[in-house]
Interface confidence: medium
């Protein structure tokens, strides 16, 4: 994949790889970067109670409803 | 529920130019891309350009470029496209689209733009 | 440019019928791939994404495969709503581009 694959996908994305099978209770904080000309993706990274940030996948059902509220100020997206 | 409203049919002349609208609701405008596609009959599905409202950011087909241009009103919530120079082969039906968590898919779609050049 | 080649570009089949329509990439777009459905004078329906993700709302008898180069649509029993045109699309590489479509038909 050339510079156009780059500019399309990577430009300046946080996250490189998403971390599966997260407890929620092992959060205890979240971010949510929404799309924009840094990323063309949403990003979610979490910081666990051990210290640890990951990567969480958006798409993940746990997260799902929670980042539609903090993208869509309330609004109920499809 | 995540709504494009497009602009209703165009019949113009040639070499004259049109703006289609797309005005969204549902979501929040300035966090997702809008993309802009031309389907022509027998000519299938053609990637315009995308746009990130949130920061001005477009992208354009080489094929489009001085063909199309990409603007968008974040206080309405609605995307544009201006397309100049029209000719017969500018006739199509121009569809705006909403993409997913990742501008590398179109979640929602407008219900698209019936563009007639004809003299 | 990368060519998204997608067949049959047409097809009939009956009712219940399992029903596969692939996409060949012309280089590796790494499941950057989404299925989209469209009837006539209608807008494109999204169906998959990521290659494999089933859209919001989108039955599942539709399912989407593949890796690479090489994808797949799956309609695991096919209903009469099912007959439509379906396009691929890839968005792995500048500018995405869109497979010439499959026209289904009942039989």
């Known amino acids: 994949a050339g510079p156009a694959a780059a500019v399309l996908r990577e430009l300046r994305c946080v996250c490189l790889q998403t971390t599966q099978g997260v407890h929620p209770k092992m959060i205890s904080n979240l971010q949510v970067f929404a799309i924009g000309p840094q990323c063309s993706k949403v990003e979610v990274v979490a910081s666990l109670k051990n210290g640890k940030e990951i990567c969480l996948d958006p798409e993940a059902p746990f997260l799902k409803k929670v980042i539609q509220k903090i993208l869509d100020g309330g609004n109920k997206e499809n | 529920q995540v709504q494009l409203q497009q602009s209703g049919a165009e019949l113009v002349r040639p070499g004259t130019s049109v703006t289609i609208s797309c005005k969204a609701s549902?979501?929040?405008?300035?966090?997702?891309?809008i993309v802009w596609v031309k389907q022509r009959p027998g000519h299938g599905l053609e990637w315009i350009g995308d746009l990130y409202s949130g920061g001005g950011y477009t992208f354009y087909s080489e094929n489009f470029k001085g063909k199309a241009t990409l603007t968008a009103d974040t206080s309405s919530s609605t995307a544009y496209m201006h397309l100049i120079s029209l000719t017969s082969e500018d006739s199509a039906v121009y569809f705006c689209?909403?993409?997913?968590?990742?501008?590398?898919?179109?979640?929602?779609w407008g219900q698209g733009s019936l563009v007639t050049v004809s003299s | 440019d990368i060519k998204m080649t997608q067949s049959p570009s047409s097809m009939s089949a009956s009712l219940g019928e399992r029903v596969t329509i692939t996409c060949q990439a012309s280089?590796?777009?790494?499941?950057?791939l989404s299925w989209y459905q469209q009837k006539p004078w209608k807008s494109p329906k999204t169906l998959i994404y990521?290659?494999?993700r089933l859209a919001d709302g989108v039955p599942s008898r539709f399912s989407g495969s593949g890796s690479g180069q090489d994808y797949s649509l799956t309609i695991s029993s096919l209903e009469s709503d099912d007959t439509a045109t379906y396009y691929c699309l890839q968005h792995g590489e500048s500018p995405p581009t869109f497979g010439a479509g499959t026209k289904l038909e009942l039989k």
């Open positions: 280089q590796d777009i790494e499941s950057y």
């Open positions: 549902g979501y929040t405008f300035t966090n997702y891309w």
């Open positions: 689209a909403r993409s997913g968590y990742d501008r590398t898919w179109f979640a929602h």
């Open positions: 990521y290659a494999t």
